[in-house]
């Protein structure tokens, strides 16, 4: 039986290419270490966008070169994906793993459809 | 029962606030005069965005002050809504009426969710 993970159905990226959404998991007990992965689904293909492991005491930490940032509060994770372009429009799935202590649990959300519109270029200043 | 009307589920407005989609109706016979209405649904409320009557021979013509433009080809109508802002994000329903000759037919699509993102203002040129 998988762990329930909830995420919004649709999110619009800002005109600067930034999209934020909350990923909430059904906490089963007192997980001390949680891993959150954002996957992009295209057809039957899944590609990893970013991932982070955090402990309940510490802040959520993505790698420095990651397109994602995030904060956590209890069983909610606030995820932000940056640098999005129109071609990045798609379904982004939040995967949550309760890593430690045992038992291990994993759950995946139904995905958040992120829509991205490329901004019009600003006119050149004369 | 009733005439079938098809329209896309989702459309993104451009950064200039322009959204286009095709509304296609299941033509029953030889309608010479067709009326197309775009309605915006908010809750149980429907408000008319724009409407136009066209004859199969002529081009689709919206009122001069309308936020919509359109072209028609057979039983397909290409609709464009302009001047959209983020607050206009919502469900836009295409209603098609075969007005003349009798019999009268009416059909409504399931709606197109139009997402609109306001652009970032361009920096002032010094």
């Amino acid at each position: 039986k998988g762990m329930h993970v909830a995420q919004p159905a649709v999110v619009l990226a800002s005109s600067r290419g930034v999209a934020s959404f909350v990923c909430e998991y059904g906490s089963s007990g007192n997980a001390a270490e949680v891993r959150v992965t954002v996957l992009r689904q295209a057809g039957s293909q899944m590609t990893e966008v970013c991932a982070a492991t955090y402990t309940v005491e510490d802040e959520l930490a993505f790698l420095d070169d990651s397109t994602c940032t995030g904060t956590s509060s209890g069983n909610k994770v606030n995820l932000t994906i940056q640098g999005l372009r129109a071609m990045d429009t798609g379904l982004y799935i939040c995967k949550v793993e309760l890593m430690y202590p045992p038992p291990y649990y994993v759950g995946m959300g139904n995905g958040t459809q992120i829509y991205v519109i490329d901004p019009e270029p600003c006119p050149d200043s004369d | 029962k009733g005439m079938h009307v098809a329209q896309p589920a989702v459309v993104l407005a451009s950064s200039r606030g322009v959204a286009s989609f095709v509304c296609e109706y299941g033509s029953s016979g030889n309608a010479a005069e067709v009326r197309v209405t775009v309605l915006r649904q908010a809750g149980s409320q429907m408000t008319e965005v724009c409407a136009a009557t066209y004859t199969v021979e002529d081009e689709l013509a919206f009122l001069d002050d309308s936020t919509c433009t359109g072209t028609s080809s057979g039983n397909k109508v290409n609709l464009t809504i302009q001047g959209l802002r983020a607050m206009d994000t919502g469900l836009y329903i295409c209603k098609v009426e075969l007005m003349y000759p009798p019999p009268y037919y009416v059909g409504m699509g399931n709606g197109t969710q139009i997402y609109v993102i306001d652009p970032e203002p361009c920096p002032d040129s010094d």
């Epitope: - | 029962k1 009326r35 409407a51 009557t53 009426e97 007005m99 003349y100 000759p101 009798p102």
Partner: antibody, heavy 114, light 112 residues
Framework: EVQLVETGGDLMKPGGSLRLSCVAS????????MSWVRQAPEKGLQLVAG????????YYTDAVKGRFTISRDNAKNTLYLQMNSLRDEDTAVYYC???????WGQGTLVTVSS | QPVLTQPPSVSAALGQRVTISCTGT?????????VQWYQQFPGRPPKTIIY???NRPSGVPDRFSASTSGTTATLTISGLQAEDEANYYC???????????FGSGTQLTILG
């Protein structure tokens, strides 16, 4: 507010002629095809004639073909029904109706009797 | 002679639900042609309450609904109010007559 106001109904002798008018307001008249519907006590409701928005095409029920003429003047927002060779069975209240059945006028009574 | 058959009268109590049937043939209601329903008070013009089988014009309360099955169309009025007492007519296109056909009307009486 949409309004359709019919005028011209009268008491006529069989064989006579009459012209009904319907002045429209509150909507873009030139964008809508229009119809005349009549209601006689013994015959119920009947769509008599229809016309497209531009006035270039018309439709008539068999009972009035060759006797009635539907026309419109979009500049005056007015729909007409010219009724010739009137018969007893044309006695009815005549309503002006938008062709999608959305609005009806209040009606005008035409009585044909010798 | 009306082509669509309606009961001459129906009655129901305030707050109750009532249905009015409109039976046609394969060349009209059963042929997939849109059905309209009209409400008429004495001395007044008809008012369309349902168009295109089940659509309500703006201003018509959602107590009025309609459906079609086979050659019969049905108007349902729920939560009856005193002001619903009126004549109700149905209409549809008839393909063999190439004309609109109407029902003879149903007088709705509110009891109590």
């Amino acid at each position: 507010e949409v309004q359709l106001v019919e005028t011209g109904g009268d008491l006529m002798k069989p064989g006579g002629s009459l012209r009904l008018s319907c002045v429209a307001s509150g909507f873009t008249f030139s964008s809508y095809s229009m119809s005349w519907v009549r209601q006689a006590p013994e015959k119920g409701l009947q769509l008599v004639a229809g016309i497209n928005s531009g006035g270039s095409s018309t439709y008539y029920t068999d009972a009035v073909k060759g006797r009635f003429t539907i026309s419109r003047d979009n500049a005056k927002n007015t729909l007409y029904l010219q009724m010739n060779s009137l018969r007893d069975e044309d006695t009815a209240v005549y309503y002006c109706v938008i062709s999608n059945w959305s609005y009806w006028g209040q009606g005008t009574l035409v009585t044909v009797s010798s | 002679q009306p082509v669509l058959t309606q009961p001459p009268s129906v009655s129901a109590a305030l707050g109750q639900r009532v249905t009015i049937s409109c039976t046609g043939t394969a060349t009209n209601v059963g042929g997939g042609y849109d059905v309209q329903w009209y409400q008429q008070f004495p001395g007044r013009p008809p008012k369309t309450i349902i168009y295109g089988n089940y659509n309500r014009p703006s201003g018509v309360p959602d107590r009025f609904s309609a459906s079609t099955s086979g050659t019969t169309a049905t108007l349902t009025i729920s939560g009856l109010q005193a002001e619903d007492e009126a004549n109700y007519y149905c209409s549809s296109w008839d393909n063999s007559l190439t004309a609109y056909v109407f029902g003879s009307g149903t007088q709705l009486t509110i009891l109590g």
